[in-house]
Interface confidence: low
Amino acid sequence: IVLRPSRVHNSEENTMRALTLKDILNGTFSYKTFFPNWISGQEYLHQSADNNIVLYNIETGQSYTILSNRTMKSVNASNYGLSPDRQFVYLESDYSKLWRYSYTATYYIYDLSNGEFVRGNELPRPIQYLCWSPVGSKLAYVYQNNIYLKQRPGDPPFQITFNGRENKIFNGIPDWVYEEEMLATKYALWWSPNGKFLAYAEFNDTDIPVIAYSYYGDEQYPRTINIPYPKAGAKNPVVRIFIIDTTYPAYVGPQEVPVPAMIASSDYYFSWLTWVTDERVCLQWLKRVQNVSVLSICDFREDWQTWDCPKTQEHIEESRTGWAGGFFVSTPVFSYDAISYYKIFSDKDGYKHIHYIKDTVENAIQITSGKWEAINIFRVTQDSLFYSSNEFEEYPGRRNIYRISIGSYPPSKKCVTCHLRKERCQYYTASFSDYAKYYALVCYGPGIPISTLHDGRTDQEIKILEENKELENALKNIQLPKEEIKKLEVDEITLWYKMILPPQFDRSKKYPLLIQVYGGPCSQSVRSVFAVNWISYLASKEGMVIALVDGRGTAFQGDKLLYAVYRKLGVYEVEDQITAVRKFIEMGFIDEKRIAIWGWSYGGYVSSLALASGTGLFKCGIAVAPVSSWEYYASVYTERFMGLPTKDDNLEHYKNSTVMARAEYFRNVDYLLIHGTADDNVHFQNSAQIAKALVNAQVDFQAMWYSDQNHGLSGLSTNHLYTHMTHFLKQCFSLSD
């Protein structure tokens, strides 16, 4: 399947050029998306190209600037947030990144009614998190690990928590492991729908072992960064959930929400909180052994001013074949009766599908079914449920948006996106206004991305929000590689792959092959999306064939494939990459003396193990920021897939699956090992141990470290990294510079 427009005229081809590495590093061919910042059923905000904040009304067609770029510039604001009563805007500046999602910033409150910044009782700085209540203009914020509340922006703050302490007690924000591996947010507080209550998590990291690493900076002595970071089997954070009445916060203070007895009986996690009404809240909990999850619906008891979570409102989700959920346990989407809900979990055939839970999970009504997976529930209204899936034409790497009419019986299903721009758009997400009156569709490819606005009743396209015209024009004289997505059937396993081929690809010739691998549990690399990136350049300019393969452990193709790696990381993911390479060689156009593999993070782990597999298939390979032993990685992630590193659990496979155990096998390959010294996620320790094992085995290898860089290797390090890797591959493949 050719996913790029083919070039027809020879005369045109002469004027066309290949991609350069500079194109990639400069982001010359990056695309834009348009996500409306919805503020009602028919209105949204958007930051214009000249940095004005503009309010658009779809129904009247009018737009007006609510905040000028001059006001934004006056405090160097990089972000904003309108209060729901439209009286105030917070402006965010001095952004300072912490971990993947978290950052601190300075916040200013601008009063739209008088066009001035609010003076008096200004917010402290830097703030770790700040948000408006869903109604009115109350503010909740986190400063120095404690939560504060303001009834109005100019009011003095009410301090809700007092025990917050750096690296010890976190209130309203997650610690490192909850941020990265459980919540995937920078916040851990949630307003009730009308702003009556504020729920928040408290994380106690007092007993967690600390990872310490040097940050070299510019000073005479390096700083030491200390992060409470539970590695596999270590002591975990202790979490508690509290709810406070924000109308009378001093009346009874924060009330703790009880943990279900079957969860509290051993180590556990809190996984998410969903408000149902102002007086009903849904909490999700997970046993440390992550195959049992409990969804608990709790009600406010006015007489006692407490939260009651009856056992009859506990819903248990258990996996007998793997871990609970996909990457995370799915969250419920409640219906209008405020007790029943829709949720994605595995059906009896082992495919993730939407279920409707009215009383018990056992009696759940299955809403979708088939040998494909429902991926996300976007919105439930009184008569429609919108979701995404990879059902259409049986391509797991696609995403289309569907509507199920739940107001009529029997419910009918309609694919909203399948035939809109079929060649250009096969991978969508969506963003809905209140009550789904309108929605935006964002198409990520395989053609050039496009964002459009639609009527939520009729699904009619109203207008194009962003079509990337400049990008389209810029690509007109570029020889892009060809891409195809196909599958291999091997021993009852389906291996989907994406192959990126040089523009003048000729099946009768032999090409060097580069495998790009990630391969982590519940990931997907073979997706029908647009990208002009480093591997596009390697195909376009350097004439390489690049392949991405989704093997066992990857997502959205059923539990059999997904859970195949349960408790056995590092085995089947590697086997399937090797199997695919053998199949690619059989296709006849691969030079089997020039095959390489590279990957980052989990992909660095897989590429390292593949190079050390002893197959003789790979000439060389690169591991960027690899995991080298699962004992070095975070408890929440690792134990989900591997169990505990204890003798009576899975210690043996923890030991067997290290890169270090295979040091000898690197003797016959060229290995480039790369890591940032300030990697808070996959610690530099991982690569340090690989290097030590290789030295001890007297195996030659190449290495590059990036001082003070984290897991993303950003900024100038990115340019250096890709330049360095390009040289390494060209040398490996005997390509001239």
């Epitope: 089997g233 002591k235 975990n236 007895a261 079957m262 009986s265 051993s266 180590d267 556990y268 046993k287 440390r288 052994v289 195959n291 049992v292 009856p310 056992k311 009859t312 506990e314 248990i316 258990e318 018990t360 056992e362 134990e639 505990l644 204890t646 009576d648 659990d649």
Partner: antibody, heavy 123, light 108 residues
Framework: DVQLVESGGGVVRPGESLRLSCAAS????????MTWVRQAPGEGLEWVST???????????YYADSVKGRFTISRDSSNNTLYLQMNSLRAEDTAVYYC?????????????WGLGTLVTVSS | EIVLTQNPGTLNLSPGERATLTCRAS??????LAWYQQKPGQTPRLLIY???TRATGIPDRFSGSGSGTEFNLTISSLQNEDFAVYYC??????????FGGGTKVEIK
């Protein structure tokens, strides 16, 4: 096939001790809560004690008030064996003791039972 | 502690008849209730769990119903092999796990 085989019963005097064993096979022993239930002659079923693994590698144990402080439940996951150490035995402890496997990881209903071992406490 | 009361203590019925056994809980057992069958000299056998889910290999003449504090086990048409003692058990609120006193189903 799941199998539970109890042993260690016998006749003892009041105040003496006895250790019951239950050899388990056919399932992943460490993953399931295991329970001792007893039945006095001609009487109904009475729960005695339960043991289950917690996520941190610890085990949690639970006892009926009538045996608390006298009986100790334990398990050896390496050889798939459940134990009940019974000290300070009384006449009212006379019963057939069954070992039972929980139906799921967390729930404590019992889908498999052993054949039982008889404990008689008599002076 | 949840106390389970089973009624009647003994039920005299003929083969082919319908049997309804009742189990009352002193406080809510939610949906966490199981039923067992025990024949003389034999080990208990799980029939029903989670109020109404039949255990593996249990014939469909056995069915469970109820919720909260009132539960029933129904045997739609008694077979000779069904004459035994039946126990209910709650696992909603424990420790302690509790069993009912049992109902003996005898041949009339």
């Amino acid at each position: 096939d799941v199998q539970l085989v109890e042993s260690g019963g016998g006749v003892v005097r009041p105040g003496e001790s006895l250790r019951l064993s239950c050899a388990a096979s056919g399932f992943i022993f460490r993953n399931y809560a295991m329970t001792w239930v007893r039945q006095a002659p001609g009487e109904g079923l009475e729960w005695v004690s339960t043991i289950r693994s917690s996520g941190s590698g610890r085990t949690d144990t639970y006892y009926a008030d009538s045996v608390k402080g006298r009986f100790t439940i334990s398990r050896d996951s390496s050889n798939n064996t459940l134990y009940l150490q019974m000290n300070s035995l009384r006449a009212e402890d006379t019963a057939v003791y069954y070992c039972a496997k929980s139906g799921t990881f967390w729930d404590t209903f019992f889908d498999y039972w052993g054949l039982g071992t008889l404990v008689t406490v008599s002076s | 502690e949840i106390v389970l009361t089973q009624n009647p203590g003994t039920l005299n019925l003929s083969p082919g008849e319908r049997a309804t056994l009742t189990c009352r809980a002193s406080q809510s057992a939610g949906r966490n209730l199981a039923w067992y069958q025990q024949k003389p000299g034999q080990t208990p056998r799980l029939l029903i769990y989670d109020v109404n889910t039949r255990a593996t290999g249990i014939p469909d003449r056995f069915s469970g119903s109820g919720s909260g504090t009132e539960f029933n086990l129904t045997i739609s048409s008694l077979q000779n092999e069904d004459f035994a003692v039946y126990y209910c058990q709650q696992y909603n609120n424990w420790p302690p796990l509790t069993f009912g006193g049992g109902t003996k189903v005898e041949i009339k």
